[in-house]
């Protein structure tokens, strides 16, 4: 069964910087990845980035850089411009559209007790969508 994992990491050197890592475990070719925060895409979440494996990426503030890390995983660097750190309590969701499986989405967040540099464990919470 396909699975999506999400890790949220606070940068040790820059407490206002976070990185979201997402990956797809399963067969099929990935056609699109959507990263959102505040909830799943299309269910209250706000898009931060959309990545196509060949056409390129699109990203919106506070996203700083979206990139493919492997053929089945991506990373999204976030820059928190505010003095406080809203990212710490935020849910980040990654949706992988793959052929022929359909869409798979999981969400994750930084654990409340996280030390800088530590990442949340993989949190596969699959939201099955036969898009």
């Amino acid at each position: 069964t396909p699975e999506v994992w999400v890790q949220v990491q606070m940068e040790a050197t820059e407490l206002s910087s976070f990185t979201v890592h997402c990956g797809f475990l399963g067969p099929g070719s990935i056609s699109l990845v959507t990263v959102s925060w505040g909830g799943p895409d299309g269910a209250g979440g706000t898009k931060l980035a959309v990545l196509h494996p060949e056409l390129g990426t699109r990203q919106w503030a506070p996203a700083r850089q979206a990139r493919w890390e492997t053929q089945s995983s991506i990373s999204l660097a976030l820059e928190d411009s505010g003095a406080s750190s809203p990212f710490a309590n935020t849910t980040f969701c990654c949706k992988f559209a793959s052929f022929p499986e359909g869409s798979w989405e999981s969400c994750g967040s930084l654990p409340p007790s996280s030390d800088p540099g530590l990442s949340a464990p993989p949190t596969p919470v699959p939201i099955l969508r036969a898009d």
Epitope: P53, E54, G56, R67
Partner: antibody
Framework: QVQLQQSGAELVKPGASVKISCKAT????????IEWVKQRPGHGLAWIGE????????NYNEKFKGKATFTADTSSNTAYMQLSSLTSEDSAVYYC???????WGQGTLVTVSA | DIVMTQSPSSLSVSAGEKVTMSCKSS????????????LAWYQQKPGQPPKLLIY???TRESGVPDRFTGSGSGTDFTLTISSVQAEDLAVYYC????????TFAAGTKLELK
Amino acid sequence: QVQLQQSGAELVKPGASVKISCKATGYTFSSFSIEWVKQRPGHGLAWIGEILPGSNSTNYNEKFKGKATFTADTSSNTAYMQLSSLTSEDSAVYYCSSYWFAYWGQGTLVTVSA
Amino acid sequence: DIVMTQSPSSLSVSAGEKVTMSCKSSQSLLNSGNQKNYLAWYQQKPGQPPKLLIYGASTRESGVPDRFTGSGSGTDFTLTISSVQAEDLAVYYCQNAHSYPPTFAAGTKLELK
């Protein structure tokens, strides 16, 4: 199928503003950016920026900041670009595009002339 | 910004000829993570918007004839038309799809000899 329908040609005076529209059909409007591209004869294609309908998140090319303003109306699946303080340098064909430039509108000719 | 440069600026060809045009970028368009090159090619005919031909440096868009081939990696890319047809006469643009802002080259104009 995906279609982007742009508003008609505009003749405007220097110093004035113009707002051009781009109506999208055939896909989920809020899912992908609407890009705006400028084309002047002899100057090639220049990316002005993009708006993500729904969240209204935007990215502007630094060269066009203060010149272009993007808005979008999800109820009518229409994106808008307003160009302000127009000069002869702004006379061009303006295109809207979506899905990483895979789909394009037919273009809107803006002519700035006294 | 990534600067895109195309050569030649124009080409005069006869129908049936093989044509090659070059595109160079000021920075690599290769993403090392997934080994994809983020470069696209467009065809524009007079009075029409550009049309996507090739993306990912070598993937043909749906409906594009197989006489169009994209190749290259890193900073050097090529668009080849194996046997030019009359309907191929147009301006061809390459585009950086790797990073913001998306940038286009000045284009190569394909003319009939």
